[in-house]
């Protein structure tokens, strides 16, 4: 009779995670007599997976009913294979005896595990950036097997070329991490604008994961003021119109000064948006100019969500006849943007909401 | 280590049942088959049956068909053994005995268990 | 049903002496390669013992001077030289069907 040999077919075997993985094993002889074992890796420090003779082993089952007579099949099946399950496993066979004793190992079989990489995560800045600013974004994805995966980043479709990716760890290990941080330049039509992060790997067949974050986040779009005078609405009363335009977000307070003291504040409620995501608020001072004896200096002063004040004025001289202030020219503008942004006229605007 | 602990002697009338048992330790129990093998006073060894606790499968000698019944209890991984209308030669020592190999022999043995039939 | 005749029935050997105990089957327990016969030892208000397996393969912890051998119908279970802790009566057992056992040879020293 030719001497046992253990057979194990497969050098390797690469399983998804979650599914069971089948580890074949077969030997070539009834002699001699003992049980069959299973081990992850080798060594001292290898592992018990399964024991024919005893234990508790509640993954495993045996592929073929091993009690019957000449069974020689001591395949195993594994369920609910994790990343941590990857190793090489051998298919021990061993002697009967006071105790069992190890006489003959298969060549082992290489069990790899597919993970799916987890949803990408995007994170944008802490604090809101400016238009023309560039912002840095992190991606992050954890537990993927194997090793190799592709990202890429796109801003609305757009690929971009400005980034850093890293995959831990960089040794052998169970499963692995992909870090990535890209840099983005805000424009002032980012509010709508969307920065993906695209994820492809082995086991999603050719459906990569997205992680976005909405610029709507990040960007911070400063207001442009202008001040204007309106068409006498009463006698002795000036109409003074502030245009808060093309800001994001909403969150605006606007103060009416009157030669340097505060008239009136309100909060950006009812606002116009623009195509682009961007808000426009008009806000208007009636003034009683039989109140003032001297030139008024109007001031309109807006806080855009939390950031220091602009502001821009309008001399209102109340020397000429009220009836000459209805147009723009009996009273000299000189109000000027704190700001340096430039006024222009916003063909974008869908409707406007005026508030008394 | 493998040991098969067996219950005490029974002293039994003819017609009367036994029902031996045979609790199993140091190994997996429902992975072996169990055997069951008697040896009246002086005589020979005789083969029962066999049961595999896995799935309750069993091979009985003909001469036993219809009078033994082996079960297991896998909760307590013990083996019974059954002998039902009982007559005087079936005095004997009975045996568990444990198939290592699964080659339908016996490897390990309990230290049996003297069932008596008189009257 | 196959049947186990075993020869002789008892047989006295000398110390130091090779005994050797036959085991004829009522047909072959040949099958799948291997011969389905096995050899036990049993003494005295004990259980028996495995000695031999598949014929010729000595169980665990079987002192080298027990040996088994045949093929078939025709078996024999050989002590090189016998002890005196040897003296048992000896059993074989086939299992190329269900399990049958010879009916047993009583080993003593002359």
């Known amino acids: 009779e030719e001497e046992l040999q253990v057979i194990q077919p497969d050098k390797s075997v690469s399983v998804a995670a979650g599914e069971s993985a089948i580890l074949h094993c077969t030997v070539t002889s009834l002699i001699p007599v003992g049980p069959i074992q299973w081990f992850r890796g080798a060594g001292p420090a290898r592992e018990l997976i399964y024991n024919q003779k005893e234990g508790h082993f509640p993954r495993v089952t045996t592929v073929s009913e091993s009690t019957k007579r000449e069974n020689m099949d001591f395949s195993i099946s594994i369920s609910n294979i994790t990343p941590a399950d990857a190793g090489t496993y051998y298919c021990v066979k061993f002697r009967k005896g006071s105790p069992d004793t190890e006489f003959k190992s298969g060549a082992g079989t290489e069990l790899s595990v597919r993970a799916k990489p987890s949803a990408p995560v995007v994170s944008g800045p802490a604090a809101r950036a400016t238009p023309q600013h560039t912002v840095s974004f992190t991606c992050e994805s954890h537990g993927f097997s194997p090793r190799d995966i592709t990202l890429k980043w796109f801003k609305n479709g757009n690929e971009l070329s400005d980034f850093q990716t890293n995959v831990d760890p960089v040794g052998e290990s169970v499963s692995y991490s992909i870090h990535s941080t890209a840099k983005v330049v805000l424009t002032r039509e980012d509010v709508h604008s969307q920065v993906i992060c695209e994820v492809a790997h082995v086991t999603l067949q050719g459906d990569p994961l997205r992680g976005t974050a909405n610029l709507s986040e990040t960007i911070r779009v400063p207001p442009t003021l202008e001040v204007t005078q309106q068409p006498v609405r009463a006698e002795n009363q000036v109409n003074v119109t502030c245009q808060v335009r093309k800001f994001y977000p909403q969150r605006l307070q606007l103060t009416w000064l009157e030669n340097g003291n505060v008239s009136r504040t309100e909060t950006a409620s009812t606002v116009t948006e623009n195509k682009d995501g961007t808000y426009n608020w008009m806000s208007w001072l009636l003034v009683n100019v039989s109140a003032h004896r001297d030139d008024v200096k109007l001031t309109c002063q807006v806080e855009h969500d939390g950031q220091p004040a602009v502001s821009k004025s309008h001399d209102l001289k109340v020397s000429a006849h009220p009836k000459e202030q209805g147009s723009n020219t009996a009273a000299e503008n000189t109000g000027s943007n704190e700001r340096g942004s430039s006024d222009y006229k916003d063909d974008d605007d869908k409707h406007h909401h005026h508030h008394h | 280590q493998v040991q098969l602990v067996q219950s005490g002697a029974e002293v039994k009338k003819p017609g009367a049942s036994v029902k031996v048992s045979c609790k199993a330790s140091g190994y997996t129990f429902t992975n072996y088959w169990i055997n069951w093998v008697r040896q009246a006073p002086g005589q020979g060894l005789e083969w029962i049956a066999m049961i595999d606790p896995s799935d309750s499968e069993t091979h009985y000698n003909q001469i036993f068909k219809d009078r033994a019944t082996l079960t297991t209890d896998t909760s307590t991984s013990t083996a019974y053994m059954e002998l039902r209308s009982l007559r005087s030669d079936d005095t004997a020592v009975y045996y568990c005995a444990m198939d290592y190999g699964s080659l339908y022999a016996m490897d390990y043995w309990g230290r049996g268990t003297l069932v008596t039939v008189s009257s | 049903d196959i049947v186990l005749t075993q020869s002789p029935d008892s047989l006295a050997v000398s110390l130091g002496e090779r005994a050797t105990i036959n085991c004829r089957a009522s047909?072959?327990?040949?099958?799948?390669?291997?011969?389905?016969i096995f050899w036990y030892q049993q003494k005295p208000g004990q259980p028996p013992k495995l000695l031999i397996y598949?014929?010729?393969n000595r169980d665990s912890g079987v002192p080298d001077r027990f040996s088994g051998s045949g093929s078939g119908t025709d078996f024999t279970l050989t002590i090189s030289s016998l002890q005196a802790e040897d003296v048992a009566v000896y059993y074989c057992q086939h299992s190329r069907e269900l399990p049958t056992f010879g009916q047993g040879t009583k080993l003593e020293i002359k």
């Open positions: 047909q072959s327990v040949r099958s799948s390669g291997y011969n389905w």
């Open positions: 598949l014929a010729s």
